[in-house]
């Protein structure tokens, strides 16, 4: 999906009003020195691409993020504020239902959510002139 035509300000508002708080709750009890961000993004569409990938694509050691509250709210925000996003996700959602597993918060998941927080920070305030 190409995130170029999303309403970035509305997505930012959704993030700041609820998603950010859910991420903080997920990370509660984790030391702020624990994880170094290794995933970065250069502009808002790129940031959303990386956010979508880390939030919804299962990775080795962390298969369950898509069922978390912050993930569901992220999905809702993208569906509302990114034209045509919902249609591209139907097949992906069906595939996810087939491999649904119980929620387990692993250290790998905590690291991944720390990366997500970093990506959202860059989405909210990209360093490039074109904001």
């Amino acid at each position: 999906y190409d995130f170029t035509n999303c309403d970035f300000e509305k997505i930012k508002a959704a993030y700041l009003s609820t998603i950010s708080k859910d991420l903080i709750t997920y990370m509660s009890g984790t030391k702020s020195t624990e994880f170094n961000n290794t995933v970065s993004c250069s502009n808002r569409p790129h940031c959303l691409t990386e956010i979508q990938s880390l939030t919804f694509n299962p990775t080795a050691g962390c298969a369950s993020l898509a069922k978390e509250m912050f993930a569901m709210k992220t999905k809702a925000a993208l569906a509302i504020w990114c034209p045509g996003y919902s249609e591209t996700q139907i097949n992906a959602t069906q595939a996810m239902k087939k491999r649904r597993k119980r929620k387990v918060t692993t250290n790998k998941c905590l690291e991944q959510v720390s990366q997500l927080q970093g990506l959202w920070r860059r989405f909210n305030r990209p360093l490039l002139k074109q904001q």
Epitope: E9, L16, T33, G118, N124, R125, Q131
Partner: antibody, heavy 119, light 107 residues
Framework: EVQLVQSGAEVKKPGSSVKVSCKAS????????IEWVRQAPGQGLEWIGV????????NYNENFKGRATLTADKSTSTAYMELSSLRSEDTAVYYC????????????WGQGTTVTVSS | DIVMTQTPLSLSVTPGQPASISCKAS??????VTWYLQKPGQSPQLLIY???NHYTGVPDRFSGSGSGTDFTLKISRVEAEDVGVYYC?????????FGQGTKLEIK
């Protein structure tokens, strides 16, 4: 506990350079932007620029472009602001600050470094 | 550059009374406005981010509102510890810019 500790006061001659350091602790240094802001005596706040310590990306206020250089050393968790071609109007308190967890504000500030430019 | 204009530049308030500071942007900054307080002899400290969100530990008597070009910081009941200079800041466009500051004194 997050802390930003800045270097001590400096007295400089016009035309010279100054390098102010900002040592961070209590968080993953490379994960958060470091901002630089200055405040002339009795005046308001003026943004100088920002650096991403993770990759070295910077953005400067045009008013300081060519004179200000922001760098970061991940090995020591220290950010630096160097200002060259100093003039008397550069006399100010220089602050470093860290972006907050959402990327929309500065949540921790250094104690400030007084730079006096005088002949 | 986006110019942030604060009014009034100073105000003197009786403890327990309300106070209000206005901040106007020269062009729309969406909701990308932050409020800081600089107490005498100290570094600035974060109060409100993204127009109306309280930073951790900031008392409920502080509130922010507005969008686009007009923003307001309100203190419902001023206390002695609230003295200092209040700054609004926009982070919608580079360069980031601050208002000129509003000095709050206690009567």
């Amino acid at each position: 506990e997050v802390q930003l500790v800045q270097s001590g006061a400096e007295v400089k001659k016009p035309g010279s350079s100054v390098k102010v350091s900002c040592k961070a602790s209590g968080y993953a240094f490379s994960n958060y932007l470091i901002e630089w802001v200055r405040q002339a005596p009795g005046q308001g706040l003026e943004w100088i620029g920002v650096i991403d310590p993770g990759n070295g990306d910077t953005n400067y206020n045009e008013n300081f472009k060519g004179r200000a250089t922001l760098t970061a050393d991940k090995s020591t968790s220290t950010a630096y602001m160097e200002l060259s071609s100093l003039r008397s109007e550069d006399t100010a308190v220089y602050y470093c600050a860290r972006e907050d967890n959402t990327g929309t504000a500065f949540d921790y500030w250094g104690q400030g470094t007084t730079v006096t430019v005088s002949s | 550059d986006i110019v942030m204009t604060q009014t009034p530049l100073s105000l003197s308030v009786t403890p327990g009374q309300p106070a209000s500071i206005s901040c106007k942007a020269s062009q729309s900054v969406s909701s990308d406005v932050t409020w800081y307080l600089q107490k005498p002899g100290q570094s600035p400290q974060l109060l409100i981010y993204y127009v109306s969100n309280h930073y951790t530990g900031v008392p409920d008597r502080f509130s922010g509102s507005g969008s686009g070009t007009d923003f307001t910081l309100k203190i419902s009941r001023v206390e002695a510890e609230d003295v200092g200079v209040y700054y609004c800041q926009q982070h919608h466009r580079f360069p980031l810019t601050f208002g000129q500051g509003t000095k709050l004194e206690i009567k």
